[in-house]
């Protein structure tokens, strides 16, 4: 698994809706693959972490002044939807095919 | 200034192009305000950090399993351009009015 010493990458994160209290309105699935972005944004930032110019600048400043400025952070840069079965206001089970922004598609340094 | 204990916010970060080795091609300005996103993404995530659904989910999972899953990260969510004077291939000083993605406009939890 990607620890603090590894480079920014997408790792598995299985989320159980009961654990986060969302089982009260999400009927199914019981859990899903959310993924998590883990690892460091180390110099030099590789193309695969699609760094912004600001992230590149911050990385260079951190290199020069590590105690003053933090590294860029490994975060989701693109998200994917999941499909969920939920109860609407009337308690009717309803399928939402595209519940947006729930799962990581790509990670990057920002 | 925003430390680890404070909430995610935009803070000042003056960047000197000489410090990062970009003075070899950027003639002016000598330095600029890049800003930095600093602070924590604590539960509950406020509207002003414009959290994605994934960031909300990750925050809730972190609350339940703090050693297993990290918090969402405070990063630039919107960037602004700056204007720079640089030398082209012929050595001609040229103004780029919109050198995109160089300065933080907004921070958020991702």
């Amino acid at each position: 698994s990607a620890g603090a010493g590894s480079h920014c990458q997408k790792t598995s994160l299985r989320v159980n809706f009961e654990d986060i209290g969302w089982d009260s309105w999400i009927i199914a699935p019981k859990e899903y693959e959310a993924y998590e972005c883990k690892g460091g944004c180390f110099f030099p930032l590789a193309d695969d972490v699609t760094p912004t110019k600001h992230a590149i600048v911050q990385t260079l400043v951190h290199l020069k002044f590590p105690t003053k400025v933090g590294k860029a952070c490994c975060v989701p840069t693109k998200l994917s939807p999941i499909s969920v079965l939920y109860k609407d206001d009337m308690g009717v089970p309803t399928l939402k095919y595209h519940y947006e922004g729930m799962s990581v598609a790509e990670c990057g340094c920002r | 200034s925003a430390g680890a204990g404070s909430h995610c916010q935009k803070t000042s970060l003056r960047v000197n192009f000489e410090d990062i080795g970009w003075d070899s091609w950027i003639i002016a300005p000598k330095e600029y305000e890049a800003y930095e996103c600093k602070g924590g993404c604590f539960f509950p995530l406020a509207d002003d950090v414009t959290p994605t659904k994934h960031a909300i989910v990750q925050t809730l999972v972190h609350l339940k399993f703090p050693t297993k899953v990290g918090k969402a990260c405070c990063v630039p969510t919107k960037l602004s351009p700056i204007s720079v004077l640089y030398k082209d291939d012929m050595g001609v000083p040229t103004l780029k009015y919109h050198y995109e993605g160089m300065s933080v406009a907004e921070c958020g939890c991702r």
Epitope: - | S83, M90, P93
Partner: antibody
Framework: EVQLVESGGGLVQPGGSLRLSCAAS????????MNWVRQAPGKGLEWVAH??????????HYAESVRGRFTISRDDSKNSLYLQMNSLKTEDTAIYYC??????????WGQGTLVTVSS | DIVMTQSPDSLAVSLGERATINCRAS??????????MNWFQQKPGQPPKLLIY???NQGSGVPDRFSGSGSGTDFTLTISSLQAEDVAVYFC?????????FGQGTKLEIK
């Protein structure tokens, strides 16, 4: 080596017309703003007009003193710059320099061509 | 239009001595942290040559004795040790706004 060579200058009567040309070499002509700058005998420098790039739709700007009388144009395929001067006045008498550069500076200069407006 | 005013109009300096030419703009020529100020040298019978750009940066092939300083409305061109080949007319020029305008020129001679 960058070269700008002006031609077309000469003696013309007030109210007359003249067309100046500038042949460029040694740089990618189409990448640079082009200008005309003039200098009356023994006097200072005066920017006359500029023409931008194809990506700017060849936008042009003129000094107030020549607007409506002078027209700047370029032919990137021929690496050439032109200045069509109509309704010439005695105060237009000057050396006309073709200059190339960026949106920031006059980087390249020709040797100039003399335009004399006199009756 | 931005008016550029140079001082003095003419200057006589001994060889090896320092020469200083000033230029004042009718309004600030700074924007985005950049000074839109250039200096040109014109020797007799020649076209102008870019000497200093962005207030303080030397043009290509310009000797180190030439330096520029200033910001906003007030700028200075300095020749640290005058050489015979520096006899010329010097012009300041702003490129912040169209029309790009020049100072009236300063004629530099040897005393």
């Amino acid at each position: 080596e960058v070269q700008l060579v002006e031609s077309g200058g000469g003696l013309v009567q007030p109210g007359g017309s003249l067309r100046l040309s500038c042949a460029a070499s040694g740089f990618t002509f189409s990448n640079y703003w082009m200008n005309w700058v003039r200098q009356a005998p023994g006097k200072g420098l005066e920017w006359v007009a500029h023409i931008r790039l194809k990506s700017d739709n060849y936008a042009t700007h003129y000094a107030e003193s020549v607007r409506g009388r002078f027209t700047i144009s370029r032919d990137d395929s021929k690496n050439s710059l032109y200045l069509q001067m109509n309704s010439l006045k005695t105060e237009d008498t000057a050396i006309y320099y073709c200059t190339g550069g960026s949106n920031y500076v006059f980087a390249f200069w020709g040797q100039g061509t003399l335009v004399t407006v006199s009756s | 239009d931005i008016v550029m005013t140079q001082s003095p109009d003419s200057l006589a300096v001994s060889l090896g001595e320092r020469a200083t030419i000033n230029c004042r703009a009718s309004e600030s020529v700074d924007n985005y942290g950049i000074s839109f100020m250039n200096w040109f040298q014109q020797k007799p019978g020649q076209p102008p040559k870019l000497l200093i750009y962005a207030a303080s940066n030397q043009g290509s092939g310009v000797p180190d004795r030439f330096s520029g300083s200033g910001s906003g409305t007030d700028f200075t061109l300095t020749i640290s040790s005058l050489q015979a080949e520096d006899v010329a007319v010097y012009f300041c020029q702003q490129s912040k706004e169209v029309p790009w305008t020049f100072g009236q020129g300063t004629k530099l001679e040897i005393k």
